[in-house]
C-alpha cells in the first residue's frame, strides 16, 4: 500500500573540524521510494557538486572536506507523491582551531599617541585573544586594553611600552601564535641640559655643554650668531639614548651660541633648541682705544707661518681689515718667490708677523710688534742682499705702490727683547737650534746701537733656519 514519507531519524547538529568529513543522516520510511533533496541555508545542494557525496538513495549527505564556510543549517526533504513532503533540519557547526587572520605588524609611534596592534582571529569556539610582551603575558592596565576584535590598544604610548609583542588566540581545540612584532616608541628631541652663558676674558677657552635625548637619539648641531659654528672643536658621546655635545671655543668675540637637537620621525623632524651667550669682559675697549681688534687668522697666505689658531690684530683704519692685510701680504709674498732659499722663509716669517701682529692679553688685548733683533736678523743676515736691493728700488722710486712698504718693518722702530722680553714677538723660524746644522754667524754687517744685543740673547750668538726652511 502507498505510504507517505516519514523521517525516522531526524537530523541532529553535527560538529566537524575543518578538513574532516561530516555526515548528515536522513532515514525515511515510505512507499513508493521517495525523492530526497538537500539544502544548505535553504539553497539546494546540487547532486553533481563534487564537495558532497549523497548515498543510500539520498539518505546520507557527506561533506568530504569541511571548510569553515560550510557552517549552516542543512535540511533534507523527502517526497514520494503520497501525502505531503516532509523535512528535517540540523546544524553543521564547523569546529575550528584558532587562526589569526590579520596578524599584528611592526609599528613606530611617537610617545603620547595611541597605538593599535591588530590581531583578528577565526575559530570555533571563538578564540580568546591575549598578548605577550617580551617573554611575559601582557597585563592590561589603564592605558592598555585588548579590544573585542583581539587588537591591542595602547593609549598615551610611553617609552617603556616599546618592545616585542605577539598575540595568542586560544580555544578548546588549540592555540595560535602570531609572529613577533616590534613596537618602537619614538620620542621628540628634548634638551636635558642647556648650555650656560659665560662672561669671559678675551682669548680664553670656553666649553659649552648641551645634552639631549630622544628616540631615535638626536643629532646636535651648534649655531653661532645664526650660522653654523665655523671654529671650535666639538666632542660628542652617546650613552643610554642621551647625547652629550661639548663645544670648545676660543673666544675672540661675543656671540650667541645655539644648541639644536634634531631627530627624524618618518618624513618629519622634531627639534629642540637652547641658547647661551658668551660675552667678553670690557669687549668695547680694544676696538675703541686701539684702532683695531683681535681675531683668529682666517687667511691663507700666512697659514704656514702663523701658529695654528693664531690671534692677530686687525687694523680698523682699513674698511675691511682682514681683506686689506691679506692683500698686503699676498702682494709682498709674490715678490718673495725670486729671493734666495736662505732669505725666503725668514722674509715670509717677518712679513706675516709684521702685517698680522700677534695679539697679547693684558688690560686689553693688543698687538705685539716683532722683536728688533729678529727684524735685524732678516735684514742683515738672511736677506742682506735682497734688502739692499729693495731699499735701492725704493729710493729710486721704482715701486709703483706704497703697499709693499707697509709690509716691511723699520727695524729701528721696533722694541728690543733685551729691555723687555715680553714687549715683542719672536720669530720661531729664526730661533737658534742646537740640533740644527744650518747655523749662521752673528750679525756684524752693521754695529747695533746701545740697546740692540745680539740674537739670541743668552743661549748663543748664532742663528738658524728650520731644516729645509719648513714653516709649519
Amino acid at each position: 500500500l502507498p505510504k507517505a514519507p516519514v523521517i525516522t531519524t531526524p537530523l541532529e547538529t553535527v560538529d566537524a573540524l575543518v578538513e574532516e568529513v561530516a555526515t548528515f543522516m536522513c532515514a525515511v520510511e515510505s512507499y513508493p521510494q521517495p525523492e530526497i533533496s538537500w539544502t544548505r541555508n535553504k539553497i539546494l545542494i546540487k547532486l553533481f557538486d563534487t564537495r558532497y557525496s549523497i548515498r543510500e538513495n539520498g539518505q546520507l549527505l557527506t561533506i568530504l572536506s569541511v571548510e569553515d564556510s560550510d557552517d549552516g543549517i542543512y535540511c533534507c526533504t523527502a517526497n514520494n507523491g503520497v501525502g505531503g513532503a516532509v523535512e528535517s533540519c540540523g546544524a553543521l557547526q564547523v569546529k575550528m582551531k584558532p587562526k589569526i587572520t590579520r596578524p599584528p605588524i611592526n609599528v613606530k609611534i611617537i610617545e603620547g599617541l595611541k597605538a593599535v596592534l591588530p590581531c583578528t582571529t577565526m575559530g570555533n569556539p571563538k578564540p580568546s585573544v591575549s598578548w605577550i610582551k617580551g617573554d611575559s603575558p601582557l597585563r592590561e592596565n589603564s592605558r592598555t586594553a585588548v579590544l573585542e576584535s583581539g587588537s591591542l590598544r595602547i593609549h598615551n604610548v610611553q617609552k617603556e611600552d616599546a618592545g616585542q609583542y605577539r598575540c595568542v588566540a586560544k580555544n578548546s581545540l588549540g592555540t595560535a601564535y602570531s609572529k613577533v612584532v616590534k613596537l618602537e616608541v619614538e620620542v621628540f628631541a628634548r634638551i636635558l641640559r642647556a648650555p650656560e652663558s659665560h662672561n669671559v676674558t678675551f682669548g680664553s677657552f670656553v666649553t659649552l655643554h648641551c645634552t639631549a635625548t630622544g628616540i631615535p637619539v638626536p643629532t646636535i648641531t651648534w649655531i653661532e650668531n645664526g650660522n653654523a659654528v665655523s671654529s671650535g672643536s666639538i666632542q660628542e658621546s652617546v650613552k643610554d639614548r642621551v647625547i652629550d655635545s661639548r663645544l670648545q671655543l676660543f673666544i675672540t668675540k661675543p656671540g650667541l651660541y645655539t644648541c639644536i637637537a634634531t631627530n627624524k620621525h618618518g618624513e618629519k623632524f622634531s627639534t629642540a633648541k637652547a641658547a647661551a651667550t658668551v660675552s667678553i669682559a670690557e669687549w668695547s675697549k680694544p676696538q675703541k682705544d686701539n684702532k683695531g681688534y683681535c681675531a683668529q687668522y682666517r687667511g691663507e697666505v700666512c697659514n704656514a707661518v702663523l701658529a695654528k689658531d693664531a690671534l692677530v690684530f686687525l687694523n680698523t683704519s682699513y674698511a675691511d681689515p682682514e681683506e686689506a692685510q691679506e692683500l698686503l701680504v699676498h702682494t709682498a709674498w709674490n715678490e718673495l718667490k725670486v729671493v734666495s732659499p736662505l732669505c725666503r722663509p725668514a722674509a715670509e716669517a717677518l712679513l706675516c708677523n709684521h702685517v698680522f701682529q700677534e695679539c697679547s692679553p693684558g688690560v686689553v688685548p693688543t698687538p705685539i710688534p716683532i722683536c728688533r733683533e729678529y727684524c735685524l736678523a732678516v735684514k742683515e743676515l738672511f736677506c742682506a742682499k735682497e734688502w739692499l736691493a729693495m731699499e735701492e728700488k725704493t729710493h729710486r722710486g721704482l715701486y709703483r705702490s706704497e703697499m709693499h712698504l707697509l709690509s716691511v718693518p723699520e727695524c729701528s722702530k721696533l722694541p728690543s727683547m733685551h729691555w723687555d722680553p715680553t714687549a715683542c714677538a719672536r720669530l720661531p723660524h729664526l730661533d737658534y737650534n742646537k740640533e740644527n746644522p744650518k747655523t749662521f754667524p752673528p750679525m756684524t754687517s752693521s754695529k747695533p746701537s746701545v740697546d740692540i744685543p745680539n740674537l739670541p740673547s743668552s743661549s748663543s750668538s748664532s742663528f738658524s733656519v728650520s731644516p729645509t726652511y719648513s714653516m709649519t
Epitope: T201, G203, S204, F205, F250, I251, A281, D289, N290, Q296, A307, D309, A310, L311, E358, C359, S360, P361, G362, V363, T366, I368, K413, L414, P415, S416, W419, D420, P421, T422, A423, V450, D451
Partner: antibody, heavy 115, light 112 residues
Framework: EVQLVESGGGLVQPGGSLSLSCVAS????????MNWVRQAPGKGLEWLSV???????YYADSVKGRFTISRDNVKNTLYLQLNNLKPEDTALYYC?????????WGQGTQVTVSS | DIVMTQSPSSVTASVGEKVTINCKSS????????????LNWYQQRPGQSPRLLIY???TQESGIPDRFSGSGSTTDFTLTISSVQPEDAAVYYC????????FGSGTRLEIK
C-alpha cells in the same frame, strides 16, 4: 743700562694733588709700555696704570678718574698726575718698564697723604 | 679682577735647602692663542725695589741665578729655589698679566 728715576713725591693733604715724573734712560723709551705701581708701607704691590706706545692709557679701578698717566717721548719722561688724594694713597710709587712682565723698576718716590 | 692667592705667607729655610712658593689664580691665566701662562714672579729684598725673576710662568729673566725656576699652568703655579742662599732673604710676589695686573699678597722667605 736702563735707568728709571722717579721724582715729585712728598707730603700732601687729603683732597690735594701731586704730579710724579719718571725720567728714563738707556733704552728707546718711545717703543715700550710704561707702568706705575705702588706699595703702601709694610704692604704688598698694587698696579695702578699702564701707557702703551701710542699713549693709550689704562687704569686700575681703584684710581680710575683720579690719576692720569701720560708720557713725553721727546723728553723720555713718564708722568702720573694724582688728584683728589686720600690717606690710603700713601705709598711708595714706582715707575716700571714692561708690557706683560714688569721688567725694570725705579727706586720709587714716596707720597704721603696726611692732614 | 683675577685674584692671586699665595702660600705660605712666610717660610724659614736653611742655606742649601729647597723652597717652594705656591700661587693660585682665581681663573685660568693661559692665553688660548699661544698657550702661554701670563704669570710672573718677583723678588723684593728689604729696602729695595722689586726685580723680575720669572715671566710666562717658567722663563727665567736674564741675569737671574739658575736656582730660581718657575712651573705650573692654568691656575696653579710654583716658584722653586733649589738651594737657598743668604741673599735670597726677601718677599716673593706672583703677578698675573692675563688681564689688568694683580699681585699675590707675598711670601716672606727668612734664612736661618
Amino acid at each position: 743700562e736702563v735707568q728709571l728715576v722717579e721724582s715729585g713725591g712728598g707730603l700732601v693733604q687729603p683732597g690735594g694733588s701731586l704730579s710724579l715724573s719718571c725720567v728714563a734712560s738707556g733704552f728707546t723709551f718711545s717703543l715700550y709700555y710704561m707702568n706705575w705701581v705702588r706699595q703702601a708701607p709694610g704692604k704688598g704691590l698694587e698696579w695702578l696704570s699702564v701707557i702703551d706706545t701710542h699713549s693709550i692709557a689704562y687704569y686700575a679701578d681703584s684710581v680710575k678718574g683720579r690719576f692720569t698717566i701720560s708720557r713725553d717721548n721727546v723728553k723720555n719722561t713718564l708722568y702720573l698726575q694724582l688728584n683728589n688724594l686720600k690717606p690710603e694713597d700713601t705709598a711708595l710709587y714706582y715707575c716700571v718698564l714692561g708690557r706683560t712682565a714688569l721688567v725694570r723698576w725705579g727706586q720709587g718716590t714716596q707720597v704721603t697723604v696726611s692732614s | 679682577d683675577i685674584v692671586m692667592t699665595q702660600s705660605p705667607s712666610s717660610v724659614t729655610a736653611s742655606v742649601g735647602e729647597k723652597v717652594t712658593i705656591n700661587c693660585k689664580s682665581s681663573q685660568s691665566v693661559v692665553f688660548g692663542s699661544n698657550q702661554k701662562s701670563y704669570l710672573n714672579w718677583y723678588q723684593q729684598r728689604p729696602g729695595q725695589s722689586p726685580r723680575l725673576l720669572i715671566y710666562y710662568a717658567s722663563t727665567q729673566e736674564s741675569g737671574i741665578p739658575d736656582r730660581f725656576s718657575g712651573s705650573g699652568s692654568t691656575t696653579d703655579f710654583t716658584l722653586t729655589i733649589s738651594s737657598v742662599q743668604p741673599e735670597d732673604a726677601a718677599v716673593y710676589y706672583c703677578q698675573q698679566a692675563y688681564s689688568a695686573p694683580t699681585f699675590g699678597s707675598g711670601t716672606r722667605l727668612e734664612i736661618k
